[in-house]
């Protein structure tokens, strides 16, 4: 469905800034990019270009079954958790438990959800109860965001919990999808 396949492990991502510069704040930031034929706005990257090679963010993937009351998903879903502190890429270990976490003395960078995706799940219920269909919201990617002491509370609400709801993610697509094409893809996927 346009999202990269997840491995059931920890991975390290380094944001690439050069690709999508931020538009000036006074402009609608998606005048063209948020049109259906262009696939929507690009990923949001919160720091300047000079930080690109300096900071990395950890995405932890784990698989679990989804439940709704007594009902459980027929298949497990792969969830993503954005892990703790951001630090210079060269100091972050490739696997959990190796190396030391870097703690910044200057501005605080936090690893937080950047985008979410929705995934259809079918829930099987006990006692002959009819199955249920739900769409579960899952984190699709993480980002490093710079915090300073000048951030106000409304800007800090991003960081309430690691599972806080992230920004919706739009992936570039060549044109708007028709109902027919979308349905066919879904039938193939499920």
């Amino acid at each position: 469905q346009g999202w990269q396949a997840f491995k059931n492990d920890a991975t390290e991502i380094i944001p690439e800034l050069g690709e999508y510069p931020e538009p000036p704040p006074e402009l609608e930031n998606n005048k063209t990019m948020n049109r259906a034929e262009n696939g929507g706005r690009p990923p949001h990257h919160p720091f300047e270009t000079k930080d690109v090679s300096e900071y990395s963010c950890r995405e932890l993937h784990f698989t679990r079954y989804v439940t709704d009351g007594p009902c459980r998903s027929a298949k497990p879903v792969t969830e993503l958790v954005c892990s703790g502190q951001c630090g210079p890429a060269r100091l972050l270990p490739n696997a959990i438990g190796r190396g030391k976490w870097w703690r910044p003395s200057g501005p605080d960078f936090r690893c937080i959800p950047d985008r979410y995706r929705a995934q259809r799940v079918q829930l099987l219920c006990p006692g002959g109860e009819a199955p249920r269909a739900r769409k579960v919201r899952l984190v699709a990617s993480c980002k490093c965001k710079r915090l300073t002491r000048f951030h106000n509370q409304s800007e800090l609400k991003d960081f309430g919990t690691e599972a806080a709801r992230p920004q919706k993610g739009r992936k570039p697509r060549p044109r708007a999808r028709s109902a027919k094409a979308n349905q066919a893809e879904l039938e193939n996927a499920y």
Partner: antibody, heavy 121, light 109 residues
């Protein structure tokens, strides 16, 4: 609690365009999936399009393809729906509607108050 | 595009039970259409009663329930109240494209 406040009523001439705004408060727009629905006087609801988080993009109803553009200004948490080449049959109340925060994805949970667009020569 | 059909009008007595249905021109309605039900009163915006076939919202009165019946989505109102008089719309998800039914005018008489 998510609240949606829409722009005021508009009167347009056939062939013109209209841009309806929908201001989000209580949440940030970038975290919501916004949809647009219209209702002609005395008629039923009609889905125009919206953001689909399964595929990560906007999807427009076939009927409106090429005439409608949905955009968002995340700096002001305002969504816009622009409809061009207006005809008299586009006279309707236009609603914005979003999903709700939670583990399950559920659309159309919060609705704006509606914006009446009248197309008349 | 699919066409979603509902009964144009239904009448129920106060305290009575009524079932509104929602069919699809493409075949049987299933849980994979994630049926939604909305209530709309004159001069007001719609409000969601049911999502995903049977999932009620915090504001949905207990007397409303959603299900699938005979290849259609169904909204059952048990113990109708005068305030339930309204227009009811169903909505089906066709893989990211949504289609509303024509609406059912429910009269509590």
């Amino acid at each position: 609690e998510v609240q949606l406040v829409q722009s005021g009523a508009e009167v347009k001439k056939p062939g013109a365009s209209v841009k309806v705004s929908c201001k989000v408060s209580g949440y940030t727009l970038s975290e919501l999936s916004m949809h647009w629905v219209r209702q002609a006087p005395g008629k039923g609801l009609e889905w125009m399009g919206g953001f689909d988080p399964e595929v990560g993009e906007l999807i427009y109803a076939q009927k409106f393809q090429g005439r409608v553009t949905m955009t968002e200004d995340t700096s002001t948490d305002t969504a816009y729906m622009e409809l061009s080449s207006l005809r008299s049959e586009d006279t309707a109340v236009y609603y914005c509607a979003t999903d709700t925060d939670g583990y399950w994805e559920k659309f159309f949970q919060h609705w704006g108050q509606g914006t009446l667009v009248t197309v008349s020569s | 595009q699919a066409v979603v059909t509902q009964e144009p009008s239904l009448t129920v007595s106060p305290g009575g039970t009524v079932t509104l249905t929602c069919g699809s021109s493409t075949g049987a309605v299933t849980i994979d259409h994630y049926p939604y039900w909305f209530q709309q009163k004159p001069g007001q915006a719609p409000r969601t009663l049911i999502s995903d076939t049977d999932d009620k919202h915090s504001w949905t009165p207990a007397r409303f329930s959603g299900s699938l019946l005979g290849g259609k989505a169904a909204l059952t109102l048990s113990g109708a109240q005068p305030e339930d008089e309204a227009e009811y719309y169903c909505l089906l998800d066709y893989g990211g494209t949504f289609v509303f039914g024509g609406g059912t005018k429910l009269t509590v008489l």
